[in-house]
């Protein structure tokens, strides 16, 4: 299986924001490749988000998608929005190396995003 | 039901051009790469070309390089295969699949026969 | 290329009777190796993928096993529909090639 790393810990912004790097050690000359997210909760596991992109190019991810990306060589660079409290959890990078042959698979091993959502802001007196 | 039905084959002189086209049906037809294989009269397989679903790859047999285009629109659910300075020995049925396992072509057409004759 | 070597390229075998066809790849292929099955007149469908792993609706009779560069397709007991011919094919590297096929026939 192909190597793929990511950090261990990712604190979300105050807005809802997380971003992480997925990397992979590429076994071959990928020129299209597929990278889904993945969270992991209660040990159940359900994709986030996914995209395909051609090396070099950026990553599409569908438009009401909550994920966008980047990439740089065997780097992505992935951001989520809109998360809260409640999605706190284990988020997984899977990247698949399409084509040409071989496929290559690899799973990392997760990113620990801690989201706290914000303290309402208390009413000013003016 | 996953259906594929080529059309757009027959009789051409060496030289000409045909555009071979494969209507799909019964599955998100933008989920999946697909390839033309062919076989001549009396043999066996043989692999054309293939395009990724979101035609980002695309790839070629060397004999067809630089003659043969594939393509496809997937918001009309076709496959194509732009033919172009053919030879006798591109006399064949050709086949449209699906490519629904990574490398292997899980459902296939019923083929479109191409005859290169003068 | 990688070539695929198939063999025998034609058999006859009784109602009942145990099937093997093999496959040799040139170079290894891993587990890219596929069946197909092609009736008299009709189109192709794939059987077996991934060396062993059945494609959906096909009958239990039908196997596969081997790896690397060295692989058999089995039909456990011979039925009279099974009369086709079967190609193995390998997806490890492009182009993907094909065997030259293996003709069954009933005795």
């Known amino acids: 299986a192909m190597h793929v790393a990511q950090p261990a810990v990712v604190l979300a912004s105050s807005r809802g924001i997380a971003s992480f790097v997925c990397e992979y050690a590429s076994p071959g000359k990928a020129t299209e490749v597929r990278v889904t997210v993945l969270r992991q909760a209660d040990s159940q596991v359900t994709e986030v988000c996914a995209a395909t992109y051609m090396m070099g190019n950026e990553l599409t991810f569908l438009d009401d998608s909550i994920c966008t990306g980047t990439s740089s060589g065997n780097q992505v660079n992935l951001t989520i929005q809109g998360l809260r409290a409640m999605d706190t959890g284990l988020y997984i990078c899977k990247v698949e190396l399409m084509y040409p042959p071989p496929y290559y698979l690899g799973i990392g091993n997760g990113t620990q995003i801690y989201v706290i959502d914000p303290e309402p802001c208390p009413d000013s007196d003016f | 039901e996953v259906q594929l039905v080529e059309s757009g084959g027959g009789l051409v002189k060496p030289g000409g051009s045909l555009r071979l086209s494969c209507a799909a049906s019964?599955?998100?037809?933008?989920?999946?790469?697909m390839a033309w294989v062919r076989q001549a009269p009396g043999k066996g397989l043989e692999w054309v070309s293939f395009?990724?679903?979101?035609?980002?790859?695309?790839y070629y047999a060397d004999t067809e390089t630089g003659r043969f285009t594939i393509s496809r629109d997937n918001a009309k659910n076709s496959l194509y295969l732009q033919m172009n300075s053919l030879r006798a020995e591109d006399t064949a049925v050709y086949y449209c699949?699906?490519?629904?396992?990574?490398?292997?072509?899980?459902?296939w057409g019923q083929g479109t026969t191409v005859t290169v004759s003068s | 290329d990688i070539q695929m070597t198939q063999s025998p390229s034609s058999l006859s075998a009784s109602v009942g009777d145990r099937v093997t066809i093999t496959c040799r790849a040139s170079q290894d292929i891993s587990n890219y190796l596929n069946w197909y099955q092609q009736k008299p007149g009709k189109t192709v469908k794939l059987l077996i993928y991934y060396i062993s792993r059945l494609h959906s609706g096909v009958p239990s009779r039908f196997s596969g096993s081997g790896s690397g560069t060295d692989f058999t397709l089995t039909i456990s007991s011979l039925q009279p529909e099974d009369v086709a011919t079967y190609f193995c094919q390998q997806g490890r590297m492009l182009p993907w090639t094909f065997g030259g096929g293996t003709k069954v026939e009933i005795k």
């Open positions: 019964g599955f998100t037809f933008s989920d999946y790469g």
């Open positions: 699949a699906r490519s629904g396992l990574p490398y292997a072509m899980d459902y």
């Open positions: 395009i990724s679903n979101l035609a980002y790859s695309v």
